[in-house]
Interface confidence: medium
């Protein structure tokens, strides 16, 4: 599923991401935009043999199990395919674990490069939340 901007903002708010660990909703929507272009089925392969999955491009070396990533830790204890569902529950729950891990949203390269320090509130402006 490819979410609309405000549709995703509402879904993320429903799942408790607004101000989760101090990160406003705009940060999460911005991250999703530049990680996956709001596409729940996005997959991208990395040079280390891992793959990033879903709307927040969660990595198979650390966070989920795709059955084929050497040394996978599967810290979210889920199959990576669950992160590709049109229901973002699994992605949100795993993202909560990631953002609590010490580096905050710096774990997402796209957030670090494209969202951090910008007017992220623009990503939820005009949305009925």
């Amino acid at each position: 599923k490819v979410f609309g901007r405000c549709e995703l903002a509402a879904a993320m708010k429903r799942h408790g991401l607004d101000n989760y660990r101090g990160y406003s909703l705009g940060n999460w929507v911005c991250a999703a935009k530049f990680e996956s272009n709001f596409n729940t089925q996005a997959t991208n392969r990395n040079t280390d043999g891992s793959t990033d999955y879903g709307i927040l491009q969660i990595n198979s070396r650390w966070w989920c199990n795709d059955g084929r990533t050497p040394g996978s830790r599967n810290l979210c204890n889920i199959p990576c395919s669950a992160l590709l569902s049109s229901d973002i529950t699994a992605s949100v729950n795993c993202a909560k674990k990631i953002v609590s891990d010490g580096n905050g949203m710096n774990a997402w390269v796209a957030w670090r490069n494209r969202c951090k320090g910008t007017d992220v509130q623009a990503w939820i402006r005009g949305c009925r939340l």
């Epitope: 089925q41 996005a42 997959t43 392969r45 040079t47 043999g49 795709d66 059955g67 084929r68 990533t69 050497p70 199959p79 990576c80 395919s81 590709l84």
Partner: antibody
Framework: QVQLQESGAEVMKPGASVKISCKAT????????IEWVKQRPGHGLEWIGE????????YYNEKFKGKATFTADTSSNTAYMQLSSLTSEDSAVYYC?????????WGQGTTLTVS | DIELTQSPATLSVTPGDSVSLSCRAS??????LHWYQQKSHESPRLLIK???QSMSGIPSRFSGSGSGTDFTLSINSVETEDFGMYFC?????????FGGGTKLEIK
């Protein structure tokens, strides 16, 4: 137990297209990548590419882009590979395998003859 | 692409001999190297994953070693059922690649 059952041998004319199937049983089909491998005598094994049935995400070996197209039907737990514009170079045995990084589970192979 | 070179291309042995098959990668692949056996008109069979991890049901005479670019499959006291083709495969990066194979034949 995990099984991958491929479709039967095919004899095709040059220029035609063929669609090979791979039916998976014994595991959650949407969760694992299905990989396709080509084997020609004297050419060893070649990785064609892969599909994640749950999302339809595909990756192709550059060498096979434009030649192979992967699809999957999650209602029947079947993956498909279509090969187009067939030439004698496409004559080979084609395997599907479950993509675990390594390949423990293989189909029995589909022999394609182009002549 | 990572190239895997297997040697020798053919190995002629007598049952009871011990043999070593080599697989060399064109760049470091850590331990992401797997070994297969294939007999005529059969699908490949996974013997060893990640350089040295034997699969269940595989006889203990098969073992693997190496890291980086140089890998070895050893067969301690070859039995008649072991004759066939052996392939290595890397999963360190895409595209996945296979070695050209070593044919183990009866002398």
């Amino acid at each position: 137990q995990v099984q991958l059952q491929e479709s039967g041998a095919e004899v095709m004319k040059p220029g035609a297209s063929v669609k090979i199937s791979c039916k998976a049983t014994g595991y959650t089909f949407t969760t694992y990548w299905i990989e396709w491998v080509k084997q020609r005598p004297g050419h060893g094994l070649e990785w064609i590419g892969e599909i994640l049935p749950g999302s339809g995400s595909t990756y192709y070996n550059e060498k096979f882009k434009g030649k192979a197209t992967f699809t999957a039907d999650t209602s029947s737990n079947t993956a498909y590979m279509q090969l187009s514009s067939l030439t004698s170079e496409d004559s080979a045995v084609y395997y599907c395998a479950r993509g675990d990084g390594w390949y423990y589970y293989w189909g029995q192979g589909t022999t394609l003859t182009v002549s | 692409d990572i190239e895997l070179t297997q040697s020798p291309a053919t190995l002629s042995v007598t049952p009871g001999d011990s043999v070593s098959l080599s697989c060399r990668a064109s760049q470091s692949i850590s331990n992401n190297l797997h070994w297969y056996q294939q007999k005529s008109h059969e699908s490949p069979r996974l013997l060893i994953k990640y350089t040295s991890q034997s699969m269940s049901g595989i006889p203990s005479r098969f073992s693997g070693s190496g890291s980086g670019t140089d890998f070895t499959l050893s067969i301690n006291s070859v039995e008649t059922e072991d004759f066939g083709m052996y392939f290595c495969q890397q999963s360190n990066s895409w595209p996945r690649t296979f070695g050209g194979g070593t044919k183990l034949e009866i002398k």
